[in-house]
Every structure is written in structure tokens, then in C-alpha cells.
């Protein structure tokens, strides 16, 4: 099986050839396709843990506007993981977005 940070090159033979995730993408392994990192900032959140090639970023809600002294504020916002809004590749076995010409005429 493809390890963390890599993905199958051939959806019909997963785990045979595994390529590294492209920049800005991650895969936890186990033959999963790489997905784009979540951009916590764009999601309006803080980055609690940055992404890597094997795991997504972990985001947390921004603190609400301070309306009381710091020492009486409640506990920090609970960390949440924001799912990527789009996956890469868009489908692991779907049609290619670039025409594929296979020797022998098969598509």
C-alpha cells in the first residue's frame, strides 16, 4: 500500500507505484489520493497545526472580540479540522482532464 505522503499512480494497481504528493497536498497513506491542504486563514481560522505531506492543517476558530478582561475569558476555542474544499485529483479513477492517448489506441 502507498505510505503516508504518497498516492497510487495507477488506480487499477494501487500500492504498486506510489508517487509523492504534489506541493500543497497531503495523503495519510493507505492508497488514498492526495488532497489539497486546508488554508486555515482563508477559512477565517487560526492554524493550530500546519499541514504536512501526510496530514492536513488543523484549524481553530478565531477568538471572539475581547469584551472582558483577558483573565476572565473562558477556555480557548476547541480545535477543529476543516476539510479541504476540493480534492486533488478531482477523481481518482474518473476521466482525465487532459486527453490521454494510449499506445495501441485504447483510451
Amino acid at each position: 500500500r502507498c505510505r503516508a505522503g504518497t498516492q497510487p499512480l495507477d488506480s487499477y494497481k494501487p500500492g504498486v507505484d506510489c508517487a509523492p504528493c504534489p506541493p500543497g497536498h497531503f495523503s495519510p497513506g493507505d492508497n488514498q489520493a492526495c488532497k489539497p491542504w486546508t488554508n486555515c486563514t482563508l477559512a477565517g481560522k487560526h492554524t493550530l497545526q500546519p499541514a504536512s505531506n501526510s496530514s492536513d492543517a488543523i484549524c481553530e476558530d478565531r477568538d471572539p472580540p475581547a469584551t472582558q478582561p483577558q483573565e476572565t475569558q473562558g477556555p480557548p476555542a476547541r480545535p477543529i479540522t476543516v476539510q479541504p474544499t476540493e480534492a486533488w485529483p478531482r477523481t481518482s479513477q474518473g476521466p482525465s482532464t487532459r486527453p490521454v492517448e494510449v499506445p495501441g489506441g485504447r483510451a
Partner: antibody, heavy 121, light 107 residues
Framework: QVQLVQSGAEVKKPGSSVKVSCKAS????????MHWVRQAPGQGLEWIGG????????TYNQNFKDRATLTVDKSTSTAYMELSSLRSEDTAVYYC??????????????WGQGTTVTVSS | DIQMTQSPSSLSASVGDRVTITCKAS??????VAWYQQKPGKAPKLLIY???TRHTGVPSRFSGSGSGTDFTLTISSLQPEDFATYYC?????????FGGGTKVEIK
């Protein structure tokens, strides 16, 4: 049509920095990883690194990790490659190249015209 | 790093000839190999990816084969516009690496 247009030739002194730009058109810039490859005079191709415009995530060749910085400006669909602490052996043609979008294959289907960087005292 | 060794480094051929260029990887790269054509003063152009899949618009006289460590680019009938330098590239692992190139010259 899909096009990558790079900035003009640069002549730099050793120890200085250079920033090369690559303006993309004809496709959705943020959806395609942009890579940088260089070619010294009469030599082969050397991969520098790549960046995903959607989230700014980047991967570098360790040979360039400390000196190369890849950035993007999504508002102008432009990628940048800055190389610092230049030395004479950095004299080369620098190319931006779009990673093909056909699944997990890390090849380059569209290239810029190249930017010549000359490092000389 | 994975080394990609091309041979020959240069060759002379005539229009109509069958030309074969080989690329040997220093370790198993599966089928994660691409081939490019570069003409003097120009950027490389993608010919083949996934060892044997022709990129859009590439003439059928170009074909690729191989897996593991040994790969071949074949031009079945050399045309005047094919005189150029050809590079292989592996993408099974970072850093992405290229072969040293094979220059195809007119005999």
C-alpha cells in the same frame, strides 16, 4: 490558449538575489501546481521546487531549500521564484512549468519561455 | 536522489531512420517516467508521461516503453523537426530528477 510568460533577462552580482516572475493565462491558475526548473549553459535540467497557488504549499529540492523561495500572487495569476546568495554557478536559464493535471503524474505540460540569469562580478 | 542516466549522449541519424534513446534509473521508479523534447533556445515540450502515454498532440511516431529501471523513447521514422535534445524525468520520488539529455543530430 494556455501560456506562461516570464520576466526578462537579469544580470546580477555574486551574493545578491534575483526574483523571476511567471504570469499564467488561459487556465485557472490556482488549480495547477507551478514548478521551477533551471538549465545551466550546455547542461541538463534541474528541478528547483514547486508551489500550489491555492494554499501556498510548496516543496523544494533540498539543494535549493535554503536559497530559493517560491511565492504566488493569485490576484495576478503570477508565480515568483527568488534565489538568494547568488554565485557564478547559478548562471542559467530558469523556467516555470505547470504540472499536468491528469491525476498524480508529476510531469510538466506547459513551460514558460525561460529567463536567463547571469551572475557575474 | 534518483539518478537518470541517458544513452547515448548524442547520436547522428537521417530523416526516416528509427531512433532509440534509453534512460536508466538508479533505482526502481515503476512507470513514473516522462520524456521531453527541447530545441535550441526553446523550453522543453512534454512528449510522454507514465512511461508510455503520449501527451496531447504528440505524433504517433513517438513511443515510450519500459518500467522499473530501464526506459526507452523510440522515434519510428525521424522527421526534420525531430532533431533536438531529449530528456527523461522520474517522478516517483522527490527531488524530481532528469536525465542528462540525448542530442539527436542530422547525419
Amino acid at each position: 490558449q494556455v501560456q506562461l510568460v516570464q520576466s526578462g533577462a537579469e544580470v546580477k552580482k555574486p551574493g545578491s538575489s534575483v526574483k523571476v516572475s511567471c504570469k499564467a493565462s488561459g487556465y485557472t491558475f490556482k488549480d495547477y501546481t507551478m514548478h521551477w526548473v533551471r538549465q545551466a549553459p550546455g547542461q541538463g535540467l534541474e528541478w528547483i521546487g514547486g508551489i500550489y497557488p491555492n494554499n501556498g504549499g510548496s516543496t523544494y529540492n533540498q539543494n535549493f531549500k535554503d536559497r530559493a523561495t517560491l511565492t504566488v500572487d493569485k490576484s495576478t495569476s503570477t508565480a515568483y521564484m527568488e534565489l538568494s546568495s547568488l554565485r557564478s554557478e547559478d548562471t542559467a536559464v530558469y523556467y516555470c512549468a505547470r504540472m499536468g493535471y491528469h491525476g498524480p503524474h508529476l510531469d510538466f505540460d506547459v513551460w514558460g519561455q525561460g529567463t536567463t540569469v547571469t551572475v557575474s562580478s | 536522489d534518483i539518478q537518470m542516466t541517458q544513452s547515448p549522449s548524442s547520436l547522428s541519424a537521417s530523416v526516416g531512420d528509427r531512433v532509440t534513446i534509453t534512460c536508466k534509473a538508479s533505482q526502481d521508479v515503476g512507470a513514473a517516467v516522462a520524456w521531453y523534447q527541447q530545441k535550441p533556445g526553446k523550453a522543453p515540450k512534454l512528449l510522454i508521461y507514465w512511461a508510455s502515454t503520449r501527451h496531447t498532440g504528440v505524433p504517433s511516431r513517438f513511443s515510450g516503453s519500459g518500467s522499473g529501471t530501464d526506459f526507452t523513447l523510440t522515434i519510428s521514422s525521424l522527421q526534420p523537426e525531430d532533431f533536438a535534445t531529449y530528456y527523461c524525468q522520474q517522478y516517483i520520488n522527490y527531488p524530481l530528477t532528469f536525465g542528462g539529455g540525448t542530442k539527436v543530430e542530422i547525419k
